[in-house]
């Protein structure tokens, strides 16, 4: 269950992959596209509104939680827009919705090396977005073996790695990045 | 069925005023930055303001800054240009226009027109 | 700003293929729109960021964009393609439109 039905904090950030390609949206009212693109030089890139929220119950991973806490994100690309997970069709989805979220909308926040993170399905936990011919897709890791895997892997780019440490509290968070006093916007909520 | 219906046009004199009215169907009006672009008589496109879908920020061609206002009231469905001033090269064909994909969080202007009404003449003459 | 240059007129036979080039400064660095306007009517999109297609847009109009250039192709020109086309692009929250090109189909 989620902690509170207000987030603990907010950012937007644009999302790339790991290999600096970035994840954009175009919407319409009954319809969508999610590109994974290069953008050009005059490309303003699009943002998504993070919403940070604590879970009591622990994803299929241990190592990001603190206390026994997850911290699970939403992904919203404009207002009353989140990003969700279709797993019967492996698919990652817009969904205009109102709130209180469905599940398929909570993605469990995973810190990983060279400032990069990772989102786990919260309804199929082993389960991440990931990057699958140049669309997003949901993508099961085995753990033995993927840890790493370059394609689960997203740089939230206009978030302060600071600010990530703060939030996701990996113990082995190293700042790799001189350029990290990325100004950031985020919004705290006083339950 | 997106549909922009123009109105409001007609004959002015110079440093006359006028207002045009955008009737918007079809859509989720308040999701969607709007523009208004104008086309003198035998003449090209020109852009002339923009504002994003909550109306909080609004965007000039600098032909006609300080003279017109954009607003939009999204309760009606209705996107507005503010005329004052005019002038006889304001003379054209206004369109309202939208973009064709809803507005992201950061905004700016960055999409294409996509849909565009049927336009309004503006003839400003003495 | 920038200045958006087209040519004002070009010519084409029935089923050739019609370019229509939009020239300026660091063109390639944005995204080009393409606009359609028939004597009488409204315009019309019928290419964005450079090369995409809208939903009824025929396959025979295509774009690129590179270096100084946008350019618009029409393959296989037809009858109802003779009309006014326009680019455009975004510079700083301002929109830029060429002067346009009349299509005559001979």
């Known amino acids: 269950s989620i902690t509170g039905i207000s987030p603990i904090t907010e950012s937007l950030a644009s999302l790339s992959t790991y290999n600096d390609q970035s994840i954009t949206f175009a919407l319409e009212d009954e319809s969508y596209e999610i590109y994974v693109e290069d953008l050009k030089k005059d490309k303003k890139k699009d943002k998504v509104l993070l919403s940070y929220y604590e879970s009591q119950h622990p994803s299929s991973e241990s190592g990001d939680g603190v206390d026994g806490k997850m911290l699970m994100v939403t992904l919203s690309p404009t207002k009353d827009f989140w990003l969700q997970a279709n797993n019967k069709e492996h698919s990652v989805e817009l969904h205009k919705c109102e709130k209180p979220l469905p599940d398929q909308a909570f993605f469990v926040l995973h810190n990983r090396s060279f400032n990069c993170v990772s989102f786990e399905c919260k309804t199929d936990p082993g389960v991440f977005i990931g990057v699958k011919d140049n669309h997003l897709a949901l993508i099961k890791v085995d753990y033995s073996e993927n840890l790493g895997s370059e394609n689960i892997l997203f740089k939230l780019s206009e978030i302060n790695p600071a600010f990530l440490y703060k939030v996701v509290g990996a113990a082995d968070y190293k700042d790799d990045d001189d350029k990290a006093a990325h100004h950031h916007h985020h919004h705290h909520h006083h339950h | 069925e997106v549909q922009l219906l123009e109105s409001g046009g007609g004959l002015v004199q110079p440093g006359g005023s006028l207002r045009l009215s955008c009737a918007a169907s079809?859509?989720?009006?308040?999701?969607?930055?709007m523009s208004w672009v104008r086309q003198a008589p035998g003449k090209g496109l020109e852009w002339v303001s923009a504002?994003?879908?909550?109306?909080?920020?609004?965007y000039y061609a600098d032909s006609v800054k300080g003279r017109f206002t954009i607003s939009r009231d999204n309760s009606k469905n209705t996107l507005y240009l503010q005329m004052n001033s005019l002038r006889a090269e304001d003379t054209a064909v206004y369109y309202c226009?939208?973009?064709?994909?809803?507005?992201?969080w950061g905004g700016g202007l960055r999409y294409p027109f996509g849909y565009w009404g049927q336009g309004t003449m503006v003839t400003v003459s003495s | 700003l920038p200045v958006l240059t087209q040519p004002p007129s070009v010519s084409v036979s029935p089923g050739q293929k019609a370019s229509i080039t939009c020239s300026g400064e660091?063109?390639?660095?944005?995204?080009a729109a393409w606009y359609q306007q028939k004597p009488g009517q409204s315009p019309i999109l019928v290419i964005y960021?450079?090369?995409k297609r809208p939903s009824g847009i025929p396959e025979r109009f295509s774009g690129s964009n590179s270096g100084n250039t946008a350019t618009l192709t029409i393959s296989g020109t037809q009858d109802m393609d003779e009309a006014d086309y326009y680019c455009?692009?975004?510079?700083?929250?301002?929109?830029?439109f060429g002067g346009g090109t009349k299509v005559t189909v001979l």
């Open positions: 226009a939208r973009d064709l994909w809803i507005q992201l």
């Open positions: 079809g859509f989720t009006f308040s999701s969607y930055a």
């Open positions: 504002i994003s879908g909550s109306g909080g920020s609004t």
């Open positions: 660091r063109m390639g660095d944005k995204y």
């Open positions: 960021q450079d090369t």
């Open positions: 455009q692009v975004w510079d700083s929250s301002t929109g830029v």
